[in-house]
Interface confidence: low
């Protein structure tokens, strides 16, 4: 059996070498001479020759300094043979443990660590973690037991100890209130990692902490009072530019301004934010009326796109807006005036008065009236009073100028402001009908064939309106009834049928037809009748062709 005590060997030994480690023995040496040898890593396999054994005594020796961080354990096998070379023992595994020396200092995983923390962060807030490693033995020794400390903080404001580091984990946390990005946007910490729980070898690294922005600064008006002016009646006009400063990070929601008008219930103004410089642009949302209000005193508050992170006072500004008077056009009341008048209204008589009001109550202005459009030249107006009268006879049946019994005229009113302003009104004359038109036949020229003539329908037309129209009465006069007959074509008697009583010769005839409306207004019209050389329905007769060489040209 083997006798092998536990074997350990410190790394980095000074020597001299070879140096005895242990003596191994086989209790078979009582029976005869035993010779020892070793095999394995560090003996006969690389690194070869680190360990040797005295063949006869069994002394196991190390020949050079060991490095635990390269090889921490060596596994060898011991062999024992008799003088004739026969094995007297089975090979035995030998474990050689290299014990650690503190020959490695900690190494940070980065030279510079970067972290961030929100300004105003409370004590206890975790910021970042730094990490160091140590190649030494951290199981059996403190040679790799790293402790972290902060060596320095730059700047040392507002307190020289704004941060603390967990000795064991390397987690850096806030320890003091007062982180303020606007005062100190970055901190540079020199952190140390030392082994032997902080008492041994050490190394340093840098932790750069960026203090990130929160909305802890309000936008502040500077100045807080503004004046502007705007012409009346104009929307979307820039009145003034409001200036604010905000200490928070530019072009972030904590910096971007939102303006609110506190006393604009009518929604007459609007403030938009200039995205480039955060200015507030005050504009009119709708036209203002100088005559209603000449000055507005607006109170404008400014906040940010995101809410304040802490309790902050909202900055306000006062804007005085003067409304400028502008010469406004006179306004016809009503803008469209309807007047009913009979079409036989007397020439030169006043129909109506159509006047305009002057909006500029603060300017004493004179209004002058003119007729702008009067297509039939029927009207005239008093330039001072706006009284409108007829200059010619009205005619409801003048269908070129009258539509649906309505005659439209445009009137203008001009003030004497500077510049001159003109307003327009529309006058609608609703012309009531007078029975000033007798019925007329349509058509007045009629064609019949000589042979088998077809009766012809004649419509009766009256330009007036009921009751000055149908039912009509028709009568042939001046002996026309000798050759022709008429009869009514419909119950309203708005058309008649004309036909000859006998065969007529080809030629032209005149027939006198008396037509009378429902109010007995009558009129005799001459119908021109042509009898043509044809049969049935005549259409339109062709003129008789000249005869040449005694021959009739075929039709």
């Amino acid at each position: 059996d083997w006798v092998i005590p536990p074997i350990s060997c410190p790394e980095n030994e000074k020597g001299p070498f070879p140096k005895n480690l242990v003596q191994i023995k086989s209790n078979k040496d009582k029976e005869g001479k035993v010779f020892y040898s070793i095999t394995g890593q560090g003996a006969d396999t690389p690194p070869v020759g680190v360990f040797i054994i005295e063949r006869e005594t069994g002394w196991l020796k190390v020949t050079e300094p060991l490095d635990r961080e390269r090889i921490a354990t060596y596994t060898l096998f011991s062999h024992a043979v008799s003088s004739n070379g026969n094995a007297v023992e089975d090979p035995m595994e030998i474990l050689i443990t290299v014990t650690d020396q503190n020959d490695n200092k900690p190494e940070f995983t980065q030279e510079v660590f970067k972290g961030s923390v929100m300004e105003g962060a409370l004590p206890g807030t975790s910021v970042m973690e730094v990490t160091a490693t140590d190649a030494d033995d951290d199981v059996n020794t403190y040679n790799a037991a790293i402790a972290y400390t902060i060596l320095s903080q730059d700047p040392e404001l507002p307190d020289k100890n704004m941060f603390t580091i967990n000795r064991n984990t390397g987690v850096i946390s806030v320890v003091t209130t007062g982180l303020d990005r606007e005062s100190f946007p970055t901190y540079t910490l020199v952190v140390q990692a030392a082994d032997l729980q902080g008492e041994g070898l050490s190394t340093t690294a840098t932790a750069v902490i960026t203090v990130t922005d929160t909305n802890d600064n309000p936008p502040i008006f500077n100045p807080t009072t503004y004046k502007g002016q705007v012409p009346e009646n104009e929307a979307n006009v820039v009145i003034t530019t409001l200036k604010v400063t905000d200490a928070d990070a530019p072009n972030t929601p904590a910096w971007e301004a939102v303006y609110t008008i506190l006393n604009d219930d009518g929604g007459q103004f609007v403030v938009t934010t200039n995205p480039v410089n955060n200015d507030g642009i005050l504009k009119t949302a709708k036209g203002l009326d100088f005559e209603a209000k000449q000055q507005y005193i607006l109170h404008v508050a400014v906040t940010n796109v995101v809410p304040f992170e802490v309790s902050l006072t909202t900055s306000t500004a006062t804007v005085t807006v003067d409304v400028l008077d502008v010469n406004e056009a006179p306004i016809f009341v009503p803008p469209e005036k309807r007047v009913e008048v009979s079409e036989d209204f007397g020439v030169g008589q006043e129909i109506t008065s159509y006047t305009a009001q002057e909006p500029d109550t603060f300017m004493e202005q004179k209004i002058t009236y003119r007729i702008w459009r009067d297509t039939a030249n029927w009207l005239e107006i008093n330039p001072d009073t706006g009284a409108i009268s007829t200059r010619a006879e009205l005619d409801r049946e003048d269908f070129e100028h009258v539509k649906n019994s309505t005659y439209t005229a445009l009137i203008i009113a001009t003030d004497n402001g500077s510049p001159v302003a003109t307003g327009t009104g529309t006058l609608l004359l609703i012309l009531s009908d007078v029975n000033d038109n007798a019925p007329i036949p349509e058509p007045r020229t009629i064609f019949f064939c000589e042979r088998n003539p077809k009766p012809q329908v004649i419509n009766i037309i009256d330009a007036d309106l009921p009751p000055n129209t149908s039912p009509f009465t028709a009568e042939l006069t001046h002996g026309a009834s000798a050759n022709w007959t008429i009869q009514y074509n419909d119950p309203t008697q708005e058309s008649i049928i004309l036909k000859p009583k006998m065969a007529l010769e080809v030629g032209d005839y005149k027939i006198n037809l008396k037509l009378m409306d429902n109010q007995n207004k009558d009129q005799v019209t001459t119908l021109e009748v042509s009898v043509c050389d044809c049969e049935g329905a005549a259409g339109v007769c062709r003129k008789a062709q000249p005869v040449e060489a005694g021959l009739q040209i075929p039709a």
């Epitope: 004590p123 020289k160 100890n161 320890v175 003091t176 992170e309 802490v310 309790s311």
Partner: antibody, heavy 118, light 113 residues
């Protein structure tokens, strides 16, 4: 101005539970710790715990773990304390108080009296 | 937990007199990195909520009259009212805010003669 308005006084049976509310106004509710403090009649003050509405982080006095549960609702700017398994020992006035140099309490609610009686 | 002890438990003073009351902690309330003592004083008038008087041992709260003076460091602290007024009738509590759970002293009752 900062105000903390607590819910009304409660008379409850032993073994039951109660939920006290504290509505905050006049400051950024999410950015300050809300503390809860107990005061028995004629006695001193006992800190129950605190909650940070911004992220619902909370800290408790070990004595009140399991007894008090703190919650907060940012949308209504309200903090709540739920007290369970009530006994006569829980009869007290309970205050909510804003923490600023945490947990220094600069503004206090008017207090809610809880009486546990059968 | 840090234990806070106040003395005396009560005292009666006349208007205009100087009042001092003591508060001791079972461990130091001085934070070496900030050099601040994490101790506060509160005043509670009868039937009212407590009101913050002093924090960080000596910093007066908003709107607190300057007759209230906080002093001390480490484990021994004092609240002084330089010239007591009738409206100062109240209970006074000290509180450590050095570590959680924060703890209060038993209070000092100030009566006006």
């Amino acid at each position: 101005q900062v105000q903390l308005q607590q819910s009304g006084n409660e008379l409850v049976r032993p073994g039951s539970a109660v939920k006290i509310s504290c509505k905050a106004s006049g400051y950024a509710f999410s950015s300050y710790w809300m503390n809860w403090v107990k005061q028995r009649p004629g006695q001193g003050l006992e800190w129950i715990g605190q909650i940070y509405p911004g992220d619902d982080d909370s800290n408790y006095n070990g004595k009140f773990k399991g007894k008090a549960t703190l919650t907060a609702d940012k949308s209504s700017s309200s903090a709540y304390m739920h007290l369970s398994s009530l006994t006569s020992e829980d009869s007290a006035v309970y205050f909510c108080a804003r923490g600023f140099a945490t947990p220094t309490m600069d503004y206090w609610g008017q207090g809610t009296s809880v009486t546990v009686s059968s | 937990d840090i234990v806070m002890t106040q003395s005396p438990s009560s005292l009666a003073m006349s208007v205009g007199q100087k009042v001092t009351m003591s508060c001791k902690s079972s461990q130091s309330l001085l934070n070496s990195s900030t050099q601040k003592n994490y101790l506060a004083w509160y005043q509670q008038k009868p039937g009212q909520s407590p009101k913050l008087l002093i924090y960080f041992a000596s910093t007066r709260g908003s709107g607190v009259p300057d007759r209230f003076i906080g002093s001390g460091s480490g484990t021994d602290f004092t609240l002084t009212i330089s010239s007591v007024q009738t409206e100062d009738l109240a209970d006074y509590f000290c509180q450590q805010h050095y570590s959680i759970p924060c703890t209060f002293g038993g209070g000092t009752k100030l009566e006006i003669k």
